[in-house]
């Protein structure tokens, strides 16, 4: 989704929860 949009889509991209967790930890700099 681009900035300023309302994202209503449930699965717009091929990512898994495991991918998201790893990305989240990395981005948070934990």
């Amino acid at each position: 989704s681009s900035t300023g949009s309302i994202d209503m889509v449930d699965s717009p991209q091929l990512a898994t929860l495991a991918d998201e967790v790893s990305a989240s930890l990395a981005k948070q700099g934990l």
Epitope: S11, L17, E20, V21, S24, L25, K27, Q28
Partner: antibody, heavy 116, light 110 residues
Framework: QVQLQESGPSLVKPSQTLSLTCTVS????????VAWVRQAPGKVPEWLGA???????YYNPALKSRLSITRDTSKSQVSLSLSSVTTEDTAVYYC??????????WGRGLLVTVSS | QAVLTQPSSVSGSLGQRVSITCSGS?????????VGWYQQVPGSAPKLLIY???IRASGVPDRFSGSRSGDTATLTITSLQAEDEADYYC?????????FGSGTRLTVLG
């Protein structure tokens, strides 16, 4: 400074839809994930779902049929909608930065009571 | 029934070492999926202690450590302090959903 704040009604009637909003500051809902967690009085926290940085949404399978999570990037908000509520949905509802294994910043929580 | 099973309570005396286990399965903890550990005192939101199974969060004393062996993750607290008395939860994920453990109440004995 990273902050999250839950807002919405504190009292909802049975069978209605509970709608909550999480407004964040200090980070972006585009590039970071936001999770929703609830905790009934005296009970274990329950992961409801999350808005991933990819744009994907993830849901607790036990609640998926009643649950919807959306994000509004222009307002830095992630919203939760839970339909057909019962008294079992009475809980403190939290939003937090992250998904699960590294949820480092939490909102203060909002107690929502389901009662007629 | 919780996907992640913890002892309902553990206790230890001041200065002692205690461990809290989090038993999962080959679909989550045993698969190598990350585990987080949270501390919660009544009336407050959970506080992150350990992320990525074994990494201390910022500002968490080095008395707290996390590890994993097979399907079980463990939180160890050395040199127990009075302020450690709280509820502790592990958390992990499998497939496309996540969950918290059943929770452990830690009592610190005088």
């Amino acid at each position: 400074q990273v902050q999250l704040q839950e807002s919405g009604p504190s009292l909802v009637k049975p069978s209605q839809t509970l709608s909550l909003t999480c407004t964040v500051s200090g980070f972006s809902v585009i590039s970071d994930s936001v999770a929703w967690v609830r905790q009934a009085p005296g009970k274990v926290p329950e992961w409801l779902g999350a808005s991933g940085s990819s744009g994907n949404k993830y849901y607790n399978p036990a609640l998926k049929s009643r649950l919807s999570i959306t994000r509004d990037t222009s307002k830095s908000q992630v919203s939760l909608s839970l339909s057909s509520v019962t008294t079992e949905d009475t809980a403190v509802y939290y939003c937090a930065r992250g998904i699960i294994a590294g949820v480092d910043v939490w909102g203060r929580g909002l107690l929502v009571t389901v009662s007629s | 029934q919780a996907v992640l099973t913890q002892p309902s309570s553990v206790s230890g005396s001041l200065g002692q070492r205690v461990s809290i286990t989090c038993s999962g399965s080959s679909s989550n903890v045993g698969y190598g999926n990350y585990v987080g550990w949270y501390q919660q005192v009544p009336g407050s939101a959970p506080k992150l202690l350990i992320y990525g199974t074994a990494i201390r969060a910022s500002g968490v004393p080095d008395r707290f450590s996390g590890s994993r062996s097979g399907d079980t993750a463990t939180l160890t607290i050395t040199s127990l302090q009075a302020e450690d008395e709280a509820d502790y939860y592990c958390a992990s994920y499998q497939s496309n959903y996540a969950f918290f453990g059943s929770g452990t109440r830690l009592t610190v004995l005088g």
